[in-house]
C-alpha cells in the first residue's frame, strides 16, 4: 500500500496523478479533498467498495488501461459529484447498471475498449439524465446493439459506439435518443449500415462512419415513413470505397435532405473514376451540400483516372471544397467552370505547379472565388503564380505558404481585389514591389528578411515573426497598420518614438528578440503602463540579451545601478 | 540549392541484395516524391517507382515489384532503394529523382552504379 | 503500358540549324486538357536534365532554343539553333499511366 501511495501525487487543488505506474489498486486514504484522480496505465484490477468511498467531492475519475476485471457494485456509490468517468481499455466483460445509477452528475463516460458481448440486461444509462458523451463498444465482442441500451437517453453532444463487428441490431435501438450532436460508428461491414441509418436520420445532426469496408456497399430504398433528417454533416473517416459504390453512397445521402456538409477523411478509392450512372439509374440530386473536405485521400490506381465529367453537374451549388494532401496535381478546366457557387478552395498540401495550376485557373473558372489556398504545394515562382490566378476576379485571399519560392521579382499582377496574402515559410529572402499595394493582411513570417520597407497604404496587419530584422519597419509605409507580429528577429531595441509613430497601432507582438537592456531601453519600457496594453506578448517573453550580467532577464524586473545609467 | 546525393558504386555477387542511398537537400522533403530509375549500360531509362516520403505510399513498376523495396528515413531526408536477389540483369547505373507537380523529374541524383559479379 | 516510340534514333544535324525529334505515344497521353509528356536531355556520364514538362512548359532555367509541342499522342522536341552543346542524348516520358515510360531515345550528331 505505501508503494501504491507513493505512485500517486496531488496537488492543493485535489489534482491527483497517478498514471504509467505499477499500481495493482486505488491508493488507500482518499479523502473528499480529491477533485480528479487519473490513475491511467497501471496495473489495476479490481474496484472495491471502500476504495472511492470518501471521495465525495471527486469530479473526474480516469481508469483507461489497467487490468480491471471486476468493479463491485456500489463502489462508486459516494460519487455523486462525478463528471467524468473513463473505464474504457480494460476488462469488464459484464457492465452493471448498478455502477452508474449513483452517477447522477455524470457529463462523460467512457467504455470503450472493454470485452462485453452487449451493454448488458437492463438500461445500464437510464438514470444518467446529465450524460452529454457516451463512449460504448469494442473492435471484436461487441456484437450485439440491443433496443433497451439507450433507453431514457434523450439529448447527446457525442455518442461513440465501436460496433466493429456488429452482427445484430435491434430496429429502433438507436431510435429512443431524441437528439445526437455527434454520433460515431466504427464498422468494419457495412451489413447493418442501413438499418442504422433509418433509425438515427431523425436525430443525429453529424454522422461519423469509421473504418467501413463499402466496397461492395449497395443502396436499396429505405423503409423510413419519414424523410426529415436532421444530418448537417457526414463524415467518412478510413472508409474503403469503389467508383461504384461511391455512386451508391451518393444514393443514400440522397436521403439526407438537409444535408450541408460532406467529409472524407483518410479514406481509399479502389477505382479509376469511372462514375458513370447505369442506365436505370436516376441522376444524383447533391441536394444543399455547400461543403466538401477530402483529407488524404489513396487512390491506388491514381494515375488511370480519367473521367470525372459526370460528377461535374452535382458540384456547381458547392460553396466550400477542401482538397488536401491526396496528390492533386490538376483539377481539371472544365470541372473549375461547373464551380459556379465556389467560394472557398483549399488545395493544401498537394502537387500543384504554375503551369497545371494555369489549366485549373481557365478563363471563367471558380467566378464566384474568393479564398484560394495552395499552402505547400511546388510552386516556385511568384511572379507565375499571380499571373495565373488573374482569371479569378473576386479572388481577395491567397494563402501559397510553404511553397519555395526563394527570390521575388520587382513587379508581378495579381487579382486587383486583393486583400490577404500569406507567404509564410517560401524562403524568401527579400520583399520587393511584387507585393500587391491593395493588401489588408500580409504574412511573411518565417522568411529570411532583413529588411521590409514597403510602401503598402492599406495593410492593417502585418505578420513579419521569425525573420533577420533589426529595427521595426519604417511607420510611414504602414499608414493604417493595426496590428504587427514581429517576434523572434533580430530586433535589439525600439523607441516610444518609434512606436508613437504608428499611429493606428493596437496590438504588436516583438518578443523573442535579443534586446539592448539600455538604460533608454528600460525608462520607456517599464515606465509606460499603456504598453502592457498594445505589447501582447509582454512580459514574458521580452528578454534581456544584454548586458551579459542580465542576460535572459524578463525586460520588465531588470534594474541597472545608477553607475551604469549614469556614465558620461 | 537542390540537391541528391547518391551512395558510392556498389561492387555485388549474385544473388545478394545492395541499399543504395539518396539524401536530399535544398528543399522540404516530405513535399516531394522521390523516383528511382534504371539505366542499364547503354542502354535507355526504365522507371522502378516512387516513394512519397510525407506518407511512405509507394508505386512501382510491375517489373521490379518483387526486385525493389523504397524507404525513406524523414529525419535524414533520406531515400533509399534496396535491391534483392541480384542477377547480371541487374547491373545499371541507378539514379534518384525528384518529383514535381506529380508529373515530372526536375532534379537527379548523380547515379550509382552497381555492378553484379562474382 | 504505353510504348513511346522516339524518331528518328540519331539524327545528325548542322549548327545553328533546327532538330526535330519525334516522339509517339500507343495511346493518348492527355489528362484534362494537359499533355502529360517529357522530355529530358542526357549528357555522357551524367544524370538526365529536365528540359520540357506537359509537353510544351519550358523548365526554369533551360534556354530557350529548346521548345516542345504535340497532344495526344503525338510530340516533339525543337532544338533551334542547335549549339555544340546540345549534341547529346534526348529521351521522352510520359506519365499519363503507371508505369511510367521513356522513349528509347535519339542521338543528336553533328552533320
Known amino acids: 500500500e505505501s508503494s501504491n501511495q507513493a505512485s500517486l501525487s496531488c496537488d492543493r487543488n485535489g489534482i491527483c496523478k497517478g498514471s504509467s505506474g505499477s499500481l495493482n489498486s486505488i491508493p488507500s486514504g482518499l479523502t473528499e479533498a480529491v477533485k480528479s484522480l487519473d490513475l491511467s496505465n497501471n496495473r489495476i484490477t479490481y474496484i472495491s467498495n471502500s476504495d472511492l468511498q470518501r471521495c465525495v467531492n471527486l469530479q473526474a475519475l480516469v481508469l483507461t488501461s489497467n487490468g480491471i476485471n471486476t468493479i463491485e457494485e456500489d463502489s462508486f456509490s459516494s460519487l455523486g459529484s462525478l463528471e467524468h468517468l473513463d473505464l474504457s481499455y480494460n476488462y469488464l466483460s459484464n457492465l452493471s447498471s448498478s455502477w452508474f445509477k449513483p452517477l447522477s452528475s455524470l457529463t462523460f463516460l467512457n467504455l470503450l475498449g472493454n470485452p462485453y458481448k452487449t451493454l448488458g440486461e437492463t438500461s445500464l444509462f437510464s438514470h444518467l439524465t446529465k450524460l452529454q458523451i457516451l463512449r460504448v463498444g469494442n473492435m471484436d465482442t461487441f456484437t450485439k446493439i440491443q433496443r433497451k441500451d439507450f433507453a431514457g437517453l434523450t439529448f447527446l453532444e457525442e455518442l461513440e459506439i465501436d460496433a466493429s463487428d456488429l452482427q445484430s441490431y435491434e430496429p429502433k435501438s438507436l431510435k429512443s435518443i431524441q437528439n445526437v450532436s455527434h454520433l460515431i460508428l466504427h464498422m468494419k461491414q457495412h451489413i447493418l449500415l442501413l438499418e442504422i441509418f433509418v433509425d438515427v436520420t431523425s436525430s443525429v445532426e453529424c454522422l461519423e462512419l469509421r473504418d467501413t469496408d463499402l466496397d461492395t456497399f449497395h443502396f436499396s430504398e429505405l423503409s423510413t415513413g419519414e424523410t426529415n433528417s436532421l444530418i448537417k454533416k457526414f463524415t467518412f473517416r478510413n472508409v474503403k470505397i469503389t467508383d461504384e459504390s461511391l455512386f451508391q453512397v451518393m444514393k443514400l445521402l440522397n436521403q439526407i435532405s438537409g444535408l450541408l456538409e460532406l467529409e472524407f477523411d483518410d479514406c481509399t478509392l479502389n477505382g479509376v473514376g469511372n462514375f458513370r450512372a447505369s442506365d436505370n439509374d436516376r441522376v444524383i440530386d447533391p441536394g444543399k451540400v455547400e461543403t466538401l473536405t477530402i483529407r488524404r485521400l489513396h487512390i491506388p490506381r491514381f494515375y488511370l483516372f480519367y473521367d470525372l465529367s459526370t460528377l461535374y453537374s452535382l458540384t456547381e451549388r458547392v460553396k466550400r471544397i477542401t482538397v488536401e494532401n491526396s496528390k492533386v496535381f490538376l483539377v481539371p478546366c472544365l470541372l473549375s467552370q461547373h464551380l459556379k457557387s465556389l467560394e472557398y478552395l483549399d488545395l493544401s498540401e498537394n502537387l500543384m505547379v504554375e503551369e497545371y495550376l494555369k489549366n485549373s485557373a481557365c478563363e471563367d473558372a471558380w467566378p464566384s472565388l474568393q479564398t484560394l489556398i495552395l499552402r505547400q504545394n511546388h510552386l516556385a515562382s511568384l511572379e507565375k503564380t499571380g499571373e495565373t490566378l488573374l482569371t479569378l476576379k473576386n479572388l481577395t485571399n491567397i494563402d501559397i505558404s510553404k511553397n519555395s519560392f526563394h527570390s521575388m521579382p520587382e513587379t508581378c499582377q495579381w487579382p486587383e481585389k486583393m486583400k490577404y496574402l500569406n507567404l509564410s515559410s517560401t524562403r524568401i529572402h527579400s520583399v520587393t514591389g511584387c507585393i500587391p499595394k491593395t493588401l489588408e493582411i500580409l504574412d511573411v513570417s518565417n522568411n529570411n528578411l532583413n529588411l521590409f520597407s514597403l510602401n503598402l497604404p492599406q495593410l492593417k496587419e502585418l505578420y513579419i515573426s521569425r525573420n533577420k530584422l533589426m529595427t521595426l519597419p519604417d511607420a510611414s509605409l504602414l499608414p493604417m497598420l493595426l496590428v504587427l507580429k514581429i517576434s523572434r528577429n533580430a530586433i535589439t531595441t525600439f523607441s516610444k518614438e518609434q512606436l508613437d509613430s504608428f499611429h493606428t497601432l493596437k496590438t504588436l507582438e516583438a518578443g523573442g528578440n535579443n534586446f539592448i537592456c539600455s538604460c533608454e531601453f528600460l525608462s520607456f519600457t517599464q515606465e509606460q503602463q499603456a504598453l502592457a496594453k498594445v505589447l501582447i506578448d509582454w512580459p514574458a517573453n521580452y528578454l534581456c540579451d544584454s548586458p551579459s550580467h542580465v542576460r535572459g532577464q524578463q525586460v520588465q524586473d531588470v534594474r541597472l545601478s545608477v553607475s551604469e545609467c549614469h556614465r558620461t | 540549392q537542390v540537391q541528391l546525393q547518391q551512395s558510392g558504386p556498389e561492387l555485388v555477387n549474385p544473388g545478394a541484395s545492395v541499399k543504395l542511398s539518396c539524401k536530399a537537400s535544398?528543399?522540404?522533403?516530405?513535399?516531394?516524391?522521390i523516383n528511382w530509375v534504371k539505366q542499364g549500360p547503354g542502354q535507355g531509362l526504365e522507371w522502378i517507382g516512387w516513394?512519397?516520403?510525407?506518407?511512405?505510399?509507394?508505386n512501382f513498376n510491375e517489373n521490379f515489384k518483387d526486385k525493389a523495396a523504397l524507404t525513406v528515413d524523414t529525419s535524414s531526408s533520406t531515400a533509399y532503394m534496396e535491391l534483392h536477389s541480384l542477377t547480371s540483369e541487374d547491373s545499371a547505373v541507378y539514379f534518384c529523382?525528384?518529383?514535381?507537380?506529380?508529373?515530372?523529374?526536375?532534379?537527379w541524383g548523380q547515379g550509382t552504379t552497381v555492378t553484379v559479379s562474382s | 503500358d504505353i510504348e513511346l516510340t522516339q524518331s528518328p534514333a540519331s539524327l545528325a544535324v548542322s549548327l545553328g540549324q533546327r532538330a526535330t525529334i519525334s516522339c509517339r505515344a500507343s495511346?493518348?497521353?492527355?489528362?484534362?486538357?494537359?499533355?502529360?509528356m517529357q522530355w529530358y536531355q542526357q549528357k555522357p556520364g551524367q544524370p538526365p536534365k529536365l528540359l520540357i514538362f506537359?509537353?510544351?512548359n519550358v523548365e526554369s532555367g533551360v534556354p530557350v532554343r529548346f521548345s516542345g509541342s504535340g497532344s495526344g499522342t503525338d510530340f516533339s522536341l525543337n532544338i533551334h539553333p542547335v549549339e555544340e552543346d546540345d549534341i547529346v542524348m534526348y529521351f521522352c516520358?510520359?506519365?499519363?499511366?503507371?508505369?511510367?515510360?521513356f522513349g528509347g531515345g535519339t542521338k543528336l550528331e553533328i552533320k
Open positions: 529523382a525528384r518529383l514535381t507537380g506529380g508529373t515530372f523529374l526536375d532534379y
Open positions: 535544398g528543399f522540404t522533403f516530405t513535399t516531394y516524391g
Open positions: 516513394i512519397y516520403p510525407r506518407d511512405g505510399s509507394t
Open positions: 495511346e493518348s497521353v492527355e489528362y484534362y486538357g494537359t499533355s502529360l
Open positions: 506537359g509537353a510544351s
Open positions: 516520358q510520359q506519365s499519363r499511366k503507371l508505369p511510367w515510360t
